[in-house]
């Protein structure tokens, strides 16, 4: 059975990509680089420059061992662009022998008018332009090629699609004299798929479209369109699936209503309503038909779009998602939480749990957090004793077996995993919370007290003493 991974303290960064020497493979010629050693003493800088140049030219050959790097490819079709008109692109790490392809959509909020897009361009240009993208990225979590970090998908072909359209992957409008920015999220996905077909995707068995945060919502908005695109291009045998992480939002009532001034304070329904018009946003056809013209914003909300999707989708969502709380104007500042807010937060968890009731493939831990699948410690969190990679593996199996007309859940291999305990961090495997101001890790007891929970009140309904409850939470039972 699955070994419990204790190998990276929660919240820590993954190790840098290894820089290891690798001998040339058998039969490969060893290239030689001429170095001019004359008058080295007189011109050390020039000599060092040559050595540096040599090292840089050798690096791509040497970093073959545990190299986690995905390499940047800007789109050949340069008319499919980021917000500022620079070409969009993707990072790719191919895996010989695998017919599984993982396409990951990056997240990073959105902007929905000229003012907040200008501000975003000033402060977060990487999310609007490809001009400063690095040549490589390290694959972590579900994008890792290390079996210990990514137990079930390590051998897949990995594709990371950077988010540079600021439109929740929904836009279909190009930059023009009238439009200061292009919003081409939906078109970027289509173009990446088209280019990947020439790089081996044509032989795929399974394409998993995954994403976190705005990328997770992007999965819900695009998964059926990708399946349709592949069918039209003559690849109906490729099974398209979705994995939406932290993109299942509620259009609930904000804790405190504020006017729609900027991305963070604007109620999500209003932000999306404005965004769709600004981006020329497109939503899944079957969902669009369910709502009147001008009401397409509804399709950005998981519980409304999900029932209309044809492709299988696995939903991963923290019950107390930090981005959801942010748009609901809940800001945990370090001051103890008042009862009204505590009840609001608990109710949010209850509502979210309710929306996942009919989602057969779901993983929803009772934690206060945001995003999980490309975190290095994504294997740590468990719901009812099952980790997320294990649940995804069970989902794989259930989809494989459903072709054999078996509709019953696999024994000992659950895919519907939603925490039922009612308060944040009642699940002992939740990522460690840090005090926003001191940076100190908080244990469960400190966190719950900070959240304004009286330990007596929490323990009583479970027939426990507060000390017993704290012991259980600390030990992970």
């Amino acid at each position: 059975s699955e070994g419990r991974k204790t190998w990276r303290r929660r919240g820590q960064q993954p190790p840098p990509p290894p820089r290891t020497e690798a001998a040339p493979a058998a039969g490969q010629p060893v290239e030689s680089f001429p170095l001019d050693f004359t008058a080295v003493e007189g011109n050390m800088d020039s000599f060092m420059a040559q050595v540096k140049s040599l090292a840089q030219s050798l690096y791509p050959c040497s970093a073959q061992q545990l190299n986690e790097d995905l390499r940047l490819h800007l789109l050949l079709n340069t008319s499919v662009t980021c917000n500022d008109g620079s070409p969009a692109g993707y990072y790719l790490k191919e895996s010989r022998g695998s017919r599984r392809w993982l396409l990951f959509l990056e997240g990073g909020w959105y902007c929905f008018n000229r003012e907040n897009c200008d501000s975003r361009y000033d402060t977060m240009r990487r999310l609007m332009s490809s001009r400063d993208w690095p040549r490589t990225r390290t694959g972590t979590g579900i994008l890792s090629s290390q079996p210990e970090e990514n137990p079930y998908w390590w051998n897949a072909n990995m594709v990371f699609i950077p988010y540079c359209s600021s439109d929740v992957w929904s836009g279909a409008s190009s930059k023009s004299e009238k439009n200061e920015y292009a919003f081409m999220g939906a078109l970027i996905i289509q173009e990446v798929v088209r280019e990947l077909l020439g790089r081996g995707l044509s032989g795929a068995k399974v394409l998993l479209l995954a994403g976190s945060s705005a990328g997770g919502t992007g999965v819900l908005l695009n998964v059926d369109r990708v399946a349709e695109q592949l069918e039209k291009l003559g690849y109906p045998a490729i099974q398209v699936r979705g994995l939406a992480d932290s993109g299942w939002f509620l259009d609930n009532k904000q804790y405190r209503h504020t006017d729609c001034v900027d991305t963070i304070t604007c109620a999500p329904t209003e932000a999306i309503r404005r965004g769709i018009r600004y981006w020329n946003g497109v939503v899944p056809e079957r969902c669009r038909r369910q709502f009147q013209e001008g009401e397409e914003w509804n399709c950005f909300f998981g519980y409304k779009v999900y029932p209309t999707l044809r492709c299988p989708v696995f939903v991963v969502q923290w019950l107390f998602d930090e981005a959801q709380l942010t748009v609901d104007n809940v800001h945990l500042t370090g001051q103890p939480v008042q009862e009204g807010l505590r009840l609001y937060i608990q109710n949010l968890g209850r509502e979210l749990r309710h929306t996942l009731k009919d989602v057969p493939a779901s993983f929803a831990p009772a934690c206060l957090s945001h995003e999980i699948i490309i975190r290095s410690h994504w294997t740590d969190v468990q719901v009812k004793g099952t980790s997320l990679p294990r649940a995804l593996h069970c989902w794989d199996r259930s989809l494989h077996d459903s072709h054999k007309a078996s509709k019953t859940p696999l024994k000992g291999c659950p895919v519907h995993l939603v925490d039922s305990c009612p308060w944040p961090h009642c699940n002992p495997s939740c990522p460690t919370v840090r005090d926003q101001f001191t940076g100190q890790e908080m244990n469960v007891a400190q966190f719950l007290m900070h959240m304004g929970f009286d330990m007596q009140t929490v323990a009583q309904p479970q027939g426990l003493e507060p000390s017993e409850l704290l012991g259980m939470l600390s030990n992970g039972s």
């Epitope: 070994g3 991974k5 190998w7 990276r8 190790p15 820089r19 061992q65 294990r390």
Partner: antibody
Framework: EVQLQQSGPELVKPGASVKMSCKAS????????MHWVKQSHGKSLEWIGY????????GYNQKFKGRATLTVDKSSSTAYMELRSLTSEDSAVYYC???????????WGQGTTLTVSS | DIQMTQSPDSLSASVGETVTITCRAS??????LAWYQQTPGESPQLLVY???NLADNIPSRFSGSGSGTQYSLKIKSLQPEDFGSYYC????????FGAGTKLELK
């Protein structure tokens, strides 16, 4: 040249513990996961667990969890496996193996023979 | 856990012959499979990884094939140094080895 040099044979009594070593050379020790594998006499191979020398992260086969402990000493590029509460069933050859870029074990130690007998 | 069923348990062959060893997984392992050779008194040696890729410095008479749950290792034109035990191994969640196949000289 990559080499994994394991410690010599061990003869121990039932109930005791043993700690064997695997010294790595010829590559950057912290960049590769190290796995341990058991082979009983005339039998197949059985995976015990792994350790990542970079940060000490590990994972175990449930069967060995709690009885096997994997550690490393980065300064000497050495991986260790301690086995506790030994019985005759633990008599076997134990290998350390480096997990390379292929996702599989590209270099193996020569093995440490453990005999548990009273 | 995923089980790996290797067959045959043993086989006899002569130098120059071709032999095939198979490995069946209890469920789809998506080519996350390797083959190792172990000669008496030696450590195992990686032959083939991710189902079909030949490891460095392994002669081309060895080849791997298969996908899904069924995989095989073929050795063409057997050489004296090829006799020994062969193991399949997968790395998909945890690591599991097949029971092994003993290849003996006829």
């Amino acid at each position: 040249e990559v080499q994994l040099q394991q410690s010599g044979p061990e003869l121990v009594k039932p109930g005791a513990s043993v700690k064997m070593s695997c010294k790595a050379s010829g590559y950057t020790f912290t960049d590769y996961y190290m796995h341990w594998v058991k082979q009983s006499h005339g039998k197949s191979l059985e995976w015990i667990g792994y350790i990542y020398p970079n940060n000490g992260g590990n994972g175990y086969n449930q069967k060995f969890k709690g009885r096997a402990t994997l550690t490393v000493d980065k300064s000497s590029s050495t991986a260790y496996m301690e086995l506790r509460s030994l019985t005759s069933e633990d008599s076997a050859v134990y290998y350390c193996a480096r997990r390379g870029a292929t996702g599989f074990f590209d270099y193996w130690g020569q093995g440490t023979t453990l005999t548990v007998s009273s | 856990d995923i089980q790996m069923t290797q067959s045959p348990d043993s086989l006899s062959a002569s130098v120059g012959e071709t032999v095939t060893i198979t490995c069946r997984a209890s469920e789809n392992i998506y080519s996350t499979l390797a083959w190792y050779q172990q000669t008496p008194g030696e450590s195992p040696q990686l032959l083939v990884y991710t189902g079909t890729n030949l490891a460095d410095n392994i002669p081309s008479r060895f080849s791997g094939s298969g996908s899904g749950t069924q995989y095989s290792l073929k050795i063409k034109s057997l050489q004296p140094e090829d006799f020994g035990s062969y193991y399949c191994q997968h790395f998909y969640g945890t690591v599991t080895f097949g029971a092994g196949t003993k290849l003996e000289l006829k």
